[in-house]
């Protein structure tokens, strides 16, 4: 059967800081999260079946004044979907998206979402991971911050 | 045959107001809009065939000064794609996206688009609907504001 | 076999200017770029096989102060995915997205990405192209600026 995964953020273990970090805690079997014929391990989505896959990610950032003051009002809110090949140890960014934002104190609430998607050839054993900037600003809802993949066709 | 739908906004019936509302008027059979083996009824996209579907939405907001004065320059421009189960009356948000925006009077024109997409298990009889904030700012073009779904695979 | 394409920006030939232009230089056979059972010619992605396709585009814009001063700080950063029919010479926009932006000199770096996607009926011979505003601001990375398509199902 055609492999797929839809992984939602596990908010109990989101890193702090503003630098780019790899998000390693995702749900794969609760709520909207699900996986079939792929593996989730060590924060990475592992391909078990060669093929062409559509990959996607939706990342939401938010800040409310009750959470405290931002260290800077000028933010780079970014997502990077990367592929790592174990056989040839290397990591490459497949897709990136995001925006620079000025989240001023003039408003008590700020929100921003990124969506990326694309069609890629994946080989068994390759790993997909998601990196973001400013992870402490991530929206922890399952409808907000997630990524996934589904196989569309075989490699000829 | 595999079900699909691509529904485009029917701008003749867009609600006013700034609060979150469900958009119930969509075209399903003109221009780019089309549907097959799914049903559009009462503003909802009804699933007729169990399966895993890729769902997506593209929502564009715009304002030109000739349209009048905004009540606030600080806007939350949001979309929520929801699933309603009739058997167990409940509604859940599958995907959300958007941004807070400061649309100042210093510029005569403002525009912003949101795109969300994800892979979900849908059962026959379940309904997909789209909610937005500030519906009076929606771009009424068929290439701007739409949502859709296509079945990727059966449920094992 | 099911047709697909994933085309990445060829940054050696990006137009200048701020007006809307068609992007004609894309890679189809290096890095993440690939094509099968479709044709890339004269800057357009040509459909060789009737069907319903999922189309997508990811467009990133960026500016660093070291690149020089912007002619205006008020920008419309937009993408339009268009379909051209040769038999009936006409061009229509399938999808659009983007945002107006205020990229002030208060920040040395600015970034913004757009993602659009949708499900469309395409006939053999039809051509897909991508237009953007402010092409000189495009991010030339293959993970940043790309578009693609994959066939999901036949036309009944």
């Amino acid at each position: 059967a055609q492999p797929f995964a839809h992984l939602t953020i596990n908010a109990t273990n989101i890193p702090t800081g503003s630098h780019k970090v790899s998000l390693s805690s995702w749900y794969h079997d609760r709520g909207w999260a699900k996986i079939s014929n792929m593996t989730f391990s060590n924060g990475k989505l592992i391909v078990n079946q060669d093929g062409f896959y559509y990959l996607y990610a939706n990342i939401c950032f938010r800040h409310h004044e009750t959470s405290g003051d931002l260290a800077t009002e000028y933010l780079q809110l970014m997502v990077y979907v990367t592929k790592t090949s174990i056989k040839i140890p290397s990591s490459h960014t497949l897709m990136k998206g995001g925006s620079t934002k000025y989240w001023s104190g003039n408003s008590e609430f700020h929100f921003y979402s990124i969506n990326v998607g694309g069609f890629f050839k994946l080989r068994s054993g390759e790993e997909i991971s998601v990196e973001v900037s400013n992870p402490s600003l991530l929206d922890p809802d399952q409808d907000a911050t997630y990524f996934g993949a589904f196989k569309v066709r075989d490699i000829d | 045959a595999q079900p699909f739908a691509h529904l485009t906004i029917n701008a003749t019936n867009i609600p006013t107001g700034s609060h979150k509302v469900s958009l119930s008027s969509w075209y399903h059979d003109r221009g780019w809009a089309k549907i097959s083996n799914m049903t559009f009824s009462n503003g909802k996209l009804i699933v007729n065939q169990d399966g895993f579907y890729y769902l997506y939405a593209n929502i564009c907001f715009r304002h030109h000064e000739t349209s009048g004065d905004l009540a606030t320059e600080y806007l939350q421009l949001m979309v929520y794609v929801t699933k309603t189960s009739i058997k167990i009356p409940s509604s859940h948000t599958l995907m959300k996206g958007g941004s807070t925006k400061y649309w100042s009077g210093n510029s005569e024109f403002h525009f912003y688009s949101i795109n969300v997409g994800g892979f979900f298990k849908l059962r026959s009889g379940e309904e997909i609907s789209v909610e937005v904030s500030n519906p009076s700012l929606l771009d009424p073009d068929q290439d701007a504001t739409y949502f859709g779904a296509f079945k990727v695979r059966d449920i094992d | 076999a099911q047709p697909f394409a994933h085309l990445t920006i060829n940054a050696t030939n990006i137009p200048t200017g701020s007006h809307k232009v068609s992007l004609s230089s894309w890679y189809h056979d290096r890095g993440w770029a690939k094509i099968s059972n479709m044709t890339f010619s004269n800057g357009k992605l040509i459909v060789n096989q009737d069907g319903f396709y999922y189309l997508y585009a990811n467009i990133c814009f960026r500016h660093h102060e070291t690149s020089g001063d912007l002619a205006t700080e008020y920008l419309q950063l937009m993408v339009y995915v268009t379909k051209t029919s040769i038999k009936i010479p006409s061009s229509h926009t399938l999808m659009k997205g983007g945002s107006t932006k205020y990229w002030s000199g208060n920040s040395e770096f600015h970034f913004y990405s757009i993602n659009v996607g949708g499900f469309f009926k395409l006939r053999s011979g039809e051509e897909i192209s991508v237009e953007v505003s402010n092409p000189s601001l495009l991010d030339p990375d293959q993970d940043a600026t790309y578009f693609g398509a994959f066939k999901v199902r036949d036309i009944d």
Epitope: F109 | S18, G68, A71, Y74 | -
Partner: nanobody, 127 residues
Framework: EVQLVESGGGLVQAGGSLRLSCAAS????????MGWFRQAPGKEREFVGF????????YYGESVKGRFTISRDNAQNPVYLQMNSLKPEDTAVYYC????????????????????WGQGTQVTVSS
Amino acid sequence: EVQLVESGGGLVQAGGSLRLSCAASGRTFSRSAMGWFRQAPGKEREFVGFITGSGGTTYYGESVKGRFTISRDNAQNPVYLQMNSLKPEDTAVYYCGVYRRTYISSTYSESSEYDYWGQGTQVTVSS
């Protein structure tokens, strides 16, 4: 649960001043357009004033023009109603509401255009 809370009312002599405030809790309304209304016993709710989210535009009811001023802090809550040169006919319960439209319409002075009313604050002006 969304709540608006009005405060600052009281008893004041004619010619005096009061400053009312309207604070929102439960959801982000800090930058919504807001309206002040009042209701005297046995009378309909009457429009007092309106302020946009940025504070850049204000409108007033005819009976309070030149005496009342609506303002808001540069950033967040609350929205204020500064009432000067008070008259006995200003006696009423004062309410604030969140304007429900994206655009300012000609009906901004109608109470039906507002949501999330608070409990009100009593203002009594003695002669």
